[in-house]
Interface confidence: low
Amino acid sequence: KGLAFTDVDVDSIKIAWESPQGQVSRYRVTYSSPEDGIHELFPAPDGEEDTAELQGLRPGSEYTVSVVALHDDMESQPLIGTQSTAIPAPTDLKFTQVTPTSLSAQWTPPNVQLTGYRVRVTPKEKTGPMKEINLAPDSSSVVVSGLMVATKYEVSVYALKDTLTSRPAQGVVTTLENVSPPRRARVTDATETTITISWRTKTETITGFQVDAVPANGQTPIQRTIKPDVRSYTITGLQPGTDYKIYLYTLNDNARSSPVVIDASTAID
């Protein structure tokens, strides 16, 4: 008669079997895994029982279970089955960065040796593609790009071990509104140590601008944050006679537009 696995957890397996016809005084239940060898369940289930629970098992391991009915000096043919324990789910899923089209997430790995992770990102309130990413077993973070703007996503992180998949660590996150880059950006003045730029913007809510001035000679870049009502800005503290790439971004809370890039040079001393 059959052997069934009725409940599987990370460190335990419940089994059930059909009792044979005739008298049974007790059952011998043995279980083995490649890692831990063979064990016998103690105390042995008595003849009235048809279920047992194996405890203290190794997460994510395959166990071979054998049930033999015993009476006096007689024993039945074994019922044999194979079942793997579950693997624990990742925990503490956090979103470390969110942009209009991407998200970054991190989690705490389960204390089990894995073969990888699967990350599934599904739009919640819009129709759109589900994204699935497979990661190496030593990963504990992911960056998912190519997402839809201003969209609520459910993020599920599964731990994988061979053919086993854990329950997911899950979270919900909304990508940010798109931010338009500045328009018509140009250099309006340059001295030996300053460059002045001006620009225009779309009529949309913003919280400011960011300007990065990167010298071609590899010296330290200069970064400034500018108030939202400003449309002209003088970058100071530059080096004379130096070529700069100037990156100008629109900011809106945590979101940042793509940059407008301006080439400019300071005057020679």
Partner: antibody
């Protein structure tokens, strides 16, 4: 980058003892099962011993059981193999190996040579 | 213990040729518990394939594994000069884990 660096090998007389060490870096050492695998000169690979991440479970090949002891110090990211009652047939390069499963070795050290000879 | 027998012992081939290495187990090994390693002279072994057919990190796709039960194969589709080495199969289904005796792939 995962790095495993073995040390402690050398020449020892039959019946003598040696303690091998393996310094691990580039990964979170404490939850990972670690093993020692050896290779006699010109021969194939032989698994010697393994230890669970916590150090609570240890496993040995029959050929070394009772003579070798595997241990680890997670605060130092170091794996050890204490080898007693050494025999000529223990002569080999001893590799420290990181496991992804108990016995799947995804990274290996460069090895340390143990020579047992009078 | 499970005994793994590799064949042939030595394989003499030229760069660009296909190499087929065999590993036979004395009893059935779930495909999840079979791995292949490469070892070059004076170096430590390197994991190539696990789970019979999954390539380890950084392993080129000219290496592939297949098989189940007792018969497993490692195939190198086009031999590169750096592929000439000794290859070991390994099972982790039973304790102790065991390795095959190795197949040496040498330049003809």
């Amino acid at each position: 980058e995962v790095q495993l660096v073995e040390s402690g090998g050398g020449l020892v007389q039959p019946g003598g003892s040696l303690r091998l060490s393996c310094a691990a870096s580039g990964f979170t050492f404490s939850p990972i099962t670690m093993s020692w695998v050896r290779q006699a000169p010109g021969k194939g690979l032989e698994w010697v011993s393994a230890i669970s991440g916590s150090g609570g479970s240890t496993y040995y090949a029959d050929s070394v059981k009772g003579r070798f002891t595997i241990s680890r110090d997670n605060s130092k990211n170091t794996l050890y193999l204490q080898m007693n009652s050494l025999r000529a047939e223990d002569t080999a390069v001893y590799y420290c190996a990181k496991s992804t499963h108990l016995y799947l070795f995804d990274y290996w050290g460069q090895g340390t040579l143990v020579t047992v000879s009078s | 213990e499970i005994v793994l027998t590799q064949s042939p012992g030595t394989l003499s081939l030229s760069p660009g040729e296909k190499a087929t290495l065999s590993c036979r187990a004395s009893q059935s090994v779930s495909l999840h518990f079979l791995a292949w390693y490469q070892q070059k002279p004076g170096q430590a072994p390197r994991l190539l394939i696990y789970g019979a057919s999954s390539r380890a990190t950084g392993i080129p796709d000219r290496f592939s594994g297949s098989g189940s039960g007792t018969d497993f194969t490692l195939t190198i589709s086009r031999l590169e000069p750096e592929d000439f080495a000794v290859y070991y199969c390994q099972q982790m289904r039973g304790r102790p884990p065991t390795f095959g005796q190795g197949t040496k792939v040498e330049i003809k």
